[in-house]
């Protein structure tokens, strides 16, 4: 027979030879880190077919690391379900607890003994320090010094000293989350007031209000003969600007003829009295007026804007 077979868990006793005679026996022993459990044979014989009789290393078992119990308020999860050396132990904590120590331990061979690579971790209760204080506002449970997992606080704004109230920008409620970190940044309290939205040749149709504070929503429509350039719905955002910007009402142009009509600031002639109502100023040469970009205010329009109510 040629050289005897090799195995992961056991090794040949003595030096291998290039050739073996029929009937010759070779013996194996369990490798370092493995131990023998009878009764399976750990030898083989060269038979008359010039092949080795079947043998396996199933009798050699990996050394195992000591049993690790679940940490309090957590779990020890053996990778591949085994404690044998070369494998890992994963540690996870129950919800509301966090890990102190190594998340993974390795079963390692020290000499012929399998031992864990470190000390098992522990699971500590998630605790948060008090949430941030905010200017012009406060939160519930302000007297509490330590918060547990999922404890929530709700912010509210103080009464404003002036005529306009403070608006709460952001989520009012935050909770103590994983890693002892609050679920999100604290909101802020500030006066948010958008300017009165003026739309020339149009008007507001909903969302009427004395003043327009944070998240106020307004809708517009244009007068007959005008069309909406922009969104018909705008919302007062946290920067005290309308988002999207206040729309414009532009004059519906007549069907185009061969020669386009000249833009003019003169009064259009018709049976009903119409007069220009654009943001252009004064009797000037025909031109496109400069467009202002102040948020929340009507901008100059092209051409004559008839004032039709």
């Amino acid at each position: 027979c040629e050289e005897p077979p090799t195995f992961e868990a056991m090794e040949l006793i003595g030096k291998p030879k290039p050739y073996y005679e029929i009937g010759e026996r070779v013996d194996y022993k369990c490798k370092k880190g493995y131990f023998y459990i009878p009764p399976l044979a750990t030898h083989t014989i060269c038979d008359r077919n010039h092949t080795w009789l079947p043998v396996s290393d199933d009798a050699c078992y990996r050394e195992t690391c000591p049993y690790i119990r679940d940490p309090l308020n957590g779990q020890a999860v053996p990778a591949n379900g085994t404690y044998e050396f070369g494998y890992q132990m994963h540690f996870i904590c129950n919800e509301g607890y966090y890990l102190i120590g190594e998340e993974i331990l390795y079963c390692e061979l020290k000499g012929s003994v399998a031992i864990w690579s470190g000390k098992p971790p522990i699971c500590e209760k998630v605790l948060c320090t008090p949430p941030p204080k905010i200017k012009n506002g406060k939160h519930t449970f302000s007297e509490v010094e330590v918060f547990e997992y999922l404890d929530a606080v709700t912010y509210s704004c103080d009464p404003a000293p002036g005529p306009d109230p403070f608006s709460l920008i952001g989520e009012s409620t935050i909770y103590c989350g994983d890693n002892s970190v609050w679920s999100r940044a604290a909101p802020e309290c500030k006066v948010v007031k958008c300017r009165f939205p003026v739309v020339e040749n149009g008007k507001q149709i909903s969302g009427f209000g004395k003043k327009f504070y944070y998240k106020a929503t307004v809708m517009f429509e244009c007068d007959k003969g005008f069309y909406l350039d922009g969104s018909d719905t705008i919302v007062c955002d946290s920067n005290s600007t309308w988002d999207p910007p206040v729309p414009k009402c532009l004059k519906v142009l007549p069907p185009s003829s061969t020669k386009p009509p000249a833009l003019s600031h003169s009064v259009s002639t018709s049976s009903t009295t119409k007069s220009p109502a654009s943001s252009a100023s004064g009797p000037r040469p025909t031109y496109k007026p400069p467009v202002s970009n102040y948020p929340g205010y009507p901008k100059p329009e092209e051409g004559i804007l008839d004032s039709l109510d």
Partner: antibody, heavy 118, light 107 residues
Framework: EVQLVESGGGLVQPGGSLRLSCAAS????????ISWIRQSPSRGLEWLGV???????NYNSAFMSRFTISRDDSKNTAYLQMNSLKTEDTAVYYC????????????WGQGTLVTVSS | AIQLTQSPSSLSASVGDRVTITCRAS??????LNWYLQKPGQSPQLLIY???SLHSGVPDRFSGSGSGTDFTLKISRVEAEDVGVYYC?????????FGQGTKVEIK
């Protein structure tokens, strides 16, 4: 608190022109939206137009072809340029600070009288 | 333009009387209506904005109500200093317009 003072009124012939000034003290004219309003016994109170903080303007269409509102930030003054004046333009003219971006007129000056007569 | 019609055009009241002035709009203006008082020889002064909100410094004997097209200014107990011309003003739509005025005199 900003104070607005109108000036430039007087007697002018029909067809003539006049420029009224609105000087701001105690604040910057460019920080406020300024409206011009006039008052006459025959026509009552009439809103003429507004110049917004960004320099954009809106007008009462009845006056737009003849009246122009402007502003000179270096002089801290707003203006109402009136052309092709008619006898019915005789009135007291007020410049008015629009109340905090809302069309409420809470800051009336004393006004300036414009008389259009031959 | 939106027309505002005030009634009555004038009225005479005794000190302590309750006075009511109405303002009717030619089309709906929601609550976008202000009231002004022009005392003799003075410029107008803002009394009420957004139909019913009292401007700072205005006595609480003044009150406003209404919505849409019909609005009312009430003086619960008129005083001698309340004489003058009262104006309403709309601001839902350009051009912003005023009523023709209601003159209040004291008997």
């Amino acid at each position: 608190e900003v104070q607005l003072v109108e000036s430039g009124g007087g007697l002018v012939q029909p067809g003539g022109s006049l420029r009224l000034s609105c000087a701001a003290s105690g604040g910057s004219v460019s920080s406020y939206d300024i409206s011009w309003i006039r008052q006459s016994p025959s026509r009552g109170l009439e809103w003429l137009g507004v110049i917004w903080t960004d320099g954009g303007t809106n007008y009462n269409s009845a006056f737009m072809s003849r009246f122009t509102i402007s502003r000179d930030d270096s002089k801290n003054t707003a203006y109402l340029q009136m052309n092709s004046l008619k006898t019915e333009d005789t009135a007291v003219y007020y410049c008015e600070r629009v109340y905090d971006g809302y069309p409420w007129f809470a800051y009336w000056g004393q006004g300036t009288l414009v008389t259009v007569s031959s | 333009a939106i027309q505002l019609t005030q009634s009555p055009s004038s009225l005479s009241a005794s000190v302590g009387d309750r006075v009511t002035i109405t303002c009717r709009a030619s089309q709906g203006i929601a609550n976008y209506l202000n009231w002004y008082l022009q005392k003799p020889g003075q410029s107008p002064q803002l009394l009420i904005y957004y139909t019913s909100s009292l401007h700072s410094g205005v006595p609480d004997r003044f009150s406003g109500s209404g919505s849409g097209t019909d609005f009312t200014l009430k003086i619960s107990r008129v005083e001698a200093e309340d004489v003058g011309v009262y104006y309403c003003q709309q601001y839902i739509k350009l051009p912003w317009t005023f009523g023709q005025g209601t003159k209040v005199e004291i008997k």
